[in-house]
Amino acid sequence: IWELKKDVYVVELDWYPDAPGEMVVLTCDTPEEDGITWTLDQSSEVLGSGKTLTIQVKEFGDAGQYTCHKGGEVLSHSLLLLHKKEDGIWSTDILKDQKEPKNKTFLRCEAKNYSGRFTCWWLTTISTDLTFSVKSSRGSSDPQGVTCGAATLSAERVRGDNKEYEYSVECQEDSACPAAEESLPIEVMVDAVHKLKYENYTSSFFIRDIIKPDPPKNLQLKPLKNSRQVEVSWEYPDTWSTPHSYFSLTFCVQVQGKSKREKKDRVFTDKTSATVICRKNASISVRAQDRYYSSSWSEWASVPCS
Amino acid sequence: RNLPVATPDPGMFPCLHHSQNLLRAVSNMLQKARQTLEFYPCTSEEIDHEDITKDKTSTVEACLPLELTKNESCLNSRETSFITNGSCLASRKTSFMMALCLSSIYEDLKMYQVEFKTMNAKLLMDPKRQIFLDQNMLAVIDELMQALNFNSETVPQKSSLEEPDFYKTKIKLCILLHAFRIRAVTIDRVMSYLNAS
């Protein structure tokens, strides 16, 4: 058993049918010695008397808010949550496996640049009685500071019969140098509590591996005289790290017909312009990627050919 | 259709061209190592990230772009930053700080070259003959060192009398390649920045 926060405790249980559970001793936070009784949640049934209460915690029915009283007055509370260990592996019931980029990915994180700012998000089908708390650091043995905000509900989607809820959090490394070469990964830890179930999820990454630039901005077409060709131009996104000559991007320019089946023409360039043939009803899209470290491509920025 | 990327004019700043070749070569070598050594801990998540140049060179600090010198987090281990102006070309007068930056890059390359050559000698003794260092990568390191044109005392290749532990050698190779790729990215950024200055 360990303390999650004041008066909230997590009991770790080896979770299998007929498991013996864990013996837990609760102590009433009071100078009183006599006439103390204990109850669980809203029930008025007296579970025991005395300054301490010993209970055997086996299932969720044994968890909840234990309260000690004296003469009708509440003295203190202890909330017991359960953390299930199933065959040596902590349960992951609360969050959905996003399966990207690999199986058992519960937290996904992205950064728009090298400033040390990043966003993480996760999915759940649970809509109520759910709380999250997020902590982060650079490295784990001698952790350096990363400050995270509060997790907020950022999207709701309908997936088949189920509603899916997306939560996200923004974090900022306290003293980040964009040019630094990372040798210690960022660690992100999310505590999730649903009713009386506690779970924790972690992710470990280097900022360089989670970079996803914003799409190029000011995408424009300039027709070339007496030709079906156009000059496409664009700019670096505002959110990208500067100077751009140091933090350079590479670009992919795509000409896509109306039909998805039509052949796509693609050109790769380090410049912020390209000359392409603009077909009728086609659209031109440009996306960006770090020129030197191949992390994710940005989303496409698009303009119609007409 | 995938069309090739147009490469910038190498005449203006030969080091940029060489550094791009270096990054390509080390990335290919790392990919090859990860595929060949699939049963070894060779991914970024599995290895310890060690920097053999730590406390010996200070490339990131010496080559910090002027615009980042205002960022205190980038300055915690350095007194000054270079004032950019110049290139690898001998004909152009380089500033003192830039010379420091380029010499730091040269020292990095020299250290990695020695490590890689020593490692290759060990890998050649492996009866499994599982993996060797790409000669192209070693050649590209050499070319960039020559383009940088610094004279420094040659570091003798380390020789080891004891029987090599091939498992450890292969893990060390992964660690070295990961670290060298990160340094190659920094070198490429620096060269691109200098080229634009």
């Epitope: 299998y16 049918p17 007929d18 299932e59 065959d87 089908t125 | -």
Partner: antibody, heavy 115, light 111 residues
Framework: QVQLVQSGGGVVQPGRSLRLSCAAS????????MHWVRQAPGKGLEWVAF????????YYADSVKGRFTISRDNSKNTLYLQMKSLRAEDTAVYYC????????WGQGTMVTVSS | SYVLTQPPSVSGTPGQRVTISCSGG????????VKWYQQLPGTAPKLLIY???QRPSGVPDRFSGSKSGTSASLAITGVQAEDEADYYC????????????FGTGTKVTVL
Amino acid sequence: QVQLVQSGGGVVQPGRSLRLSCAASGFTFSSYGMHWVRQAPGKGLEWVAFIRYDGSNKYYADSVKGRFTISRDNSKNTLYLQMKSLRAEDTAVYYCKTHGSHDNWGQGTMVTVSS
Amino acid sequence: SYVLTQPPSVSGTPGQRVTISCSGGRSNIGNNTVKWYQQLPGTAPKLLIYGNDQRPSGVPDRFSGSKSGTSASLAITGVQAEDEADYYCQSYDRGTHPALLFGTGTKVTVL
């Protein structure tokens, strides 16, 4: 005391269907994940499928994906395995088992796929 | 499809020490705990070892388990005639959990 009693095995022709049941008692069935494991005659153990305690997630071996469906009825304390498009290679003793560091197994039920 | 490799058979005379190996990889045994089962002919498997080296109550202490790196082993010290059975190791793979990964199985013969 934990008990898992299996039923529903038998002889079936290739391409036909069969449903296995596993009735649980002696524990809070709705709190625990459950597996199906099979063993072909003279062969080793092969995992077939898993279902979470609340039925929200199901996992299958590649060899049965798209043909077998694991399900549970927590109000009846029963686990099921619906097997469709059966093949000769599905011939095996099928076991249900609880998920956890200490597990309990059903007695097994024989499924023979033969023409 | 078996990722955990065991020797097909091992044998020993009564009182001898018999060991069965179970070889896996970094993503399974290297990252997860190992169980061992005993299966007597015509019966369901019986748990002998969980959590690499833990014995459930009721399992004789002549059975012991260990794990090192990407391999595990089961030792029977002082093998007895009633130990003649098939033995299976089981673990999980990091990417496919909760799918059970079973070993190929080892037939233990008591001479």
